[in-house]
């Protein structure tokens, strides 16, 4: 059922899907499960420090299809995947960091190209 | 048009469990999630639990944790909650109840439930 | 648990009045990812199952009269009436669906004088 004025997507769920959520639950999840009328992900990222943190949790559909296609963000690595099938399916996604790998030559040292791997599961 | 159809009584001696049935038509069982709602005689009404007949994934009121165990059956198209170790505290009306969004856009009629020697 | 508290618990009223009643969760219903209220109101005829009127705070279910309105943000609803019918002789249930376990109001019961 849509509120009024709502559009009609046609990628929208009939119904409230539910996920685990780790380090990213919302003021309204209990025991760590948010529910959301998009996606469930699981993320992957290094912190300041370069320490790999993985985050899980529920996207709203609105804006979830550019979240789930992992879109490059400069000098930071992180992977990102999203499921729908059913009730908590982000428990069983696992992405990984994408590997470091050397960019081209300009002056002086060598620097680093950030490479993304793009995830979209259904 | 979406019906939800349920027994309109049962009668339970105390200590036995009972389970009680909710045959949904009209609509697409796996589309929508199952309620159980439960009132006493002049009182509110008191959520039990749900069921996502699609994979069967269940939330409780931990109220009734260890007390309702909630199952479906896709090929009968109807929804079951089972109610153990009865006592005459859990004689009431139980409604069954279905949601998209987790506000209840339709109900059975009720099963009243009563639970005596 | 989120405890949802209605008032009046009974009120009696005569055919053609505007008819309010309130409903307030012991914490905020506004959802800030999407700026909705995560409550319904329900109507519960005698002898009857309830039956949903309004959702998300203010809108109306289909096939529901427009005299039905649903008011109200974070932790004060209305449901109003605003001329009542005879047929309106019922129980009145707000429901947060904001957090698990979903819970309900006393109820107000709206007699007819």
């Known amino acids: 059922k849509k509120e009024d004025g709502e559009s009609t997507a046609p990628t929208a769920r009939p119904k409230v899907l539910r996920c685990k959520c780790h380090h990213h639950c919302p003021e309204d999840s209990v025991n760590n499960i948010c529910s959301t009328d998009g996606y469930c992900f699981t993320m992957i990222e290094e912190d300041d420090s370069g320490t790999p943190v993985v985050t899980s949790g529920c996207l709203g559909l609105e804006g979830s299809d550019f979240q789930c296609r992992d879109t490059p963000i400069p000098h930071q690595r992180r992977s990102i995947e999203c499921c729908t099938e059913r009730n908590e399916c982000n428990k069983d996604l696992h992405p990984t960091l994408p590997p470091l790998k050397d960019r081209d030559f300009v002056d002086g040292p060598i620097h680093h190209k950030h490479h993304h791997h793009h995830h979209h599961h259904h | 048009q979406v019906q939800l159809q349920q027994p309109g009584a049962e009668l339970v001696m105390p200590g036995a469990s009972v389970k009680l049935s909710c045959k949904a038509s009209?609509?697409?069982?796996?589309?929508?999630?199952m309620h159980w709602v439960k009132q006493r005689p002049g009182q509110g009404l008191e959520w039990i639990g749900d069921?996502?007949?699609?994979?069967?994934?269940?939330n409780y009121n931990h109220k009734f944790k260890g007390k309702a165990t909630l199952t479906v059956d896709k090929s009968s198209s109807t929804a079951y909650m089972q109610l153990s170790s009865l006592t005459s505290e859990d004689s009431a009306v139980y409604y069954c109840a279905r949601s998209g969004w987790d506000y209840f856009d339709s109900w059975g009629q009720g099963t009243t439930l009563t639970v005596s020697s | 648990d989120i405890v949802m508290t209605q008032s009046p618990s009974s009120l009696a009223m005569s055919v053609g009045q505007k008819v309010t009643m309130s409903c307030k969760s012991s914490?905020?219903?506004?959802?800030?990812?999407?700026?909705?209220?995560?409550l319904a109101w329900y109507q519960q005829k005698p002898g009857q199952s309830p039956k949903l009127l309004v959702y998300f705070a203010s809108t109306r279910e289909s096939g529901v009269p427009d005299r039905f309105i649903g008011s109200g943000s974070g932790t004060d609803f209305t449901l109003t009436i605003s001329s009542v019918q005879a047929e309106d002789l019922a129980d009145y249930f707000c429901q947060q669906y904001y957090r698990i376990p979903w819970t309900f109001g006393g109820g107000t019961k709206l007699e007819i004088k």
């Open positions: 069921i996502d007949p699609s994979d069967t994934y269940t």
């Open positions: 914490q905020s219903l506004l959802k800030s990812s999407n700026q909705k209220n995560y």
């Open positions: 009209g609509y697409t069982l796996t589309n929508y999630w």
